[in-house]
């Protein structure tokens, strides 16, 4: 808190300009009118105010707007946004994408702060869903944004927004998140032809079920090993050797290097060694010839 002191003669601010950087904290408090500050917020970011000076300016705005700042002020906060607490931001009603962009710009190049997370949450909740323009904006500033959402939050993403997602936006998504995103992507890209469809759907395949992988194996897609290794283990296990061979195409040779890692390891254990041998890769660990495979999960379901 800055003590209330009278403004020295001749120092009353008539406008927000660079001369204010030479004001002490108490002079800013005494000589800058809060209403003037609010109407000239767009000038604040053009002036190199220090951490302490920004504290005083924030204090003045807080007194003027105890219920929360209007959007006309929020849009021009600039570096003053860094002084806001999540509690301050929860009082705001941010509806304009331009306001969101302006505030995200302030923190650009730095990791997502609690303020930014709260701002995004308020904005998305206010819109009711994560529309394409918002998603475009958020992933441009924070490529990992999508993967920071819970499966429940992701369920509000409309399929049309999936067009805004780039492969790198999904890098940190876990299988539960991809389970939610994959059906949306499938719907979004359903009218594309085979090769174009595969290019778009590839990043989402960590959420694909077995039947979709079987269908892809019939389309000469030549899936790379990096994508294959991100597939759900339970979706890969029922695939036959022939299906995996068709799915990977020339990349099938990469299985040898991954034979000790999931899902390749678990898939090998489910295949007949005879079938694995047809690949000519020296994959070992399949079911020996003459052994009968009992599907115990099926047996339990029947009993």
């Amino acid at each position: 808190e800055v003590e209330k002191t009278a403004c020295p003669s001749g120092k009353k601010a008539r406008e927000i300009d660079e001369s204010l950087i030479f004001y002490k904290k108490w002079e800013l408090e005494a000589c800058v009118d809060a209403a003037l500050l609010a109407t000239q917020m767009d000038r604040v970011n053009a002036i190199p105010f220090t951490y302490e000076q920004l504290d005083v300016l924030k204090h003045k705005l807080d007194e003027l707007y105890p219920q929360g700042y209007p959007e006309s002020v929020i849009q021009h906060l600039g570096y003053l946004f860094l002084k806001m607490s999540p509690e301050d931001i929860r009082k705001w009603n941010v509806t304009s994408l331009e306001t969101l962009k302006a505030l995200l710009e302030v923190n650009k190049g730095h990791e997502m702060s609690p303020q930014v997370a709260t701002l995004i949450d308020r904005f998305v909740k206010g819109r009711g869903q994560l529309d394409k323009d918002t998603l475009d904006t958020l992933t441009a500033f924070y490529p990992g944004y999508l993967c920071s959402l819970s499966p429940e939050e992701l369920s509000s993403v409309p399929p049309s927004s999936i067009w805004a997602v780039r492969p790198q936006d999904l890098d940190t998504c876990d299988p539960r998140q991809l389970d939610v995103l994959y059906p949306k992507a499938r719907l979004a890209f359903q009218n594309m032809n085979g090769s174009e469809y595969f290019v778009k759907i590839q990043s989402f395949l960590g959420g694909a079920p077995t039947e979709d992988l079987k269908a892809l194996s019939q389309q000469n897609v030549s899936m790379d090993l990096a994508t294959f290794m991100k597939l759900r283990t339970d979706a890969v296990l029922p695939l036959t050797v022939a299906e995996v061979q068709k799915l990977l195409g020339p990349h099938v040779e990469g299985l040898k290097a991954e034979e000790r890692h999931r899902p390749v390891r678990d898939w090998i254990l489910r295949q007949r060694q005879d079938d694995l041998d047809t690949l000519g890769l020296g994959l070992q660990g399949g079911i020996p010839n003459g052994y009968l495979v009992l599907d115990l999960s099926m047996q339990e379901a029947l009993s």
């Epitope: 053009a46 570096y79 860094l82």
Partner: nanobody, 114 residues
Framework: VQLVESGGGLVQPGGSLRLSCAAS????????VAWYRQAPGEQREPVAA???????IYADSVKGRFTISRDNAKNTVYLQMNSLKPGDTAVYYC??????????WGQGTSVTVS
């Protein structure tokens, strides 16, 4: 954000120095910047500033002697100091934008006029 100030040293009264401040990223090309100084036992005070629009302002004590400038291509800010006085002895810092708002500072560069 990293801020690296350089160019300080020991100089006789009436002499000149040119301080440089380099920043990581494109911080100085887009933000308002300023030079500050802190004399022993004193608080840090602003000496010269440049708005994001390019206009400059100086503390009364250095007006006519110091000049702030920037090279956006090199992402560097300069402080040309002429007619130096013993009262200019201090550690000089530059800052602006995100790091200034977050109170992150460089090591500074020491200027001694004696």
């Amino acid at each position: 954000v990293q801020l690296v100030e350089s160019g300080g040293g020991l100089v006789q009264p009436g002499g000149s120095l040119r301080l440089s401040c380099a920043a990581s990223g494109s911080m100085f090309s887009i933000n308002a910047v300023a030079w500050y100084r802190q004399a022993p036992g004193e608080q840090r005070e602003p000496v010269a500033a440049m708005t994001s629009g390019g206009s400059t302002i100086y503390a009364d004590s250095v007006k006519g002697r110091f000049t702030i400038s920037r090279d956006n291509a090199k992402n560097t800010v300069y402080l040309q100091m002429n007619s130096l006085k013993p009262g200019d002895t201090a550690v000089y810092y530059c800052n602006g934008g995100w790091s200034l708002a977050m109170d992150y500072w460089g090591q500074g560069t020491s200027v001694t006029v004696s």
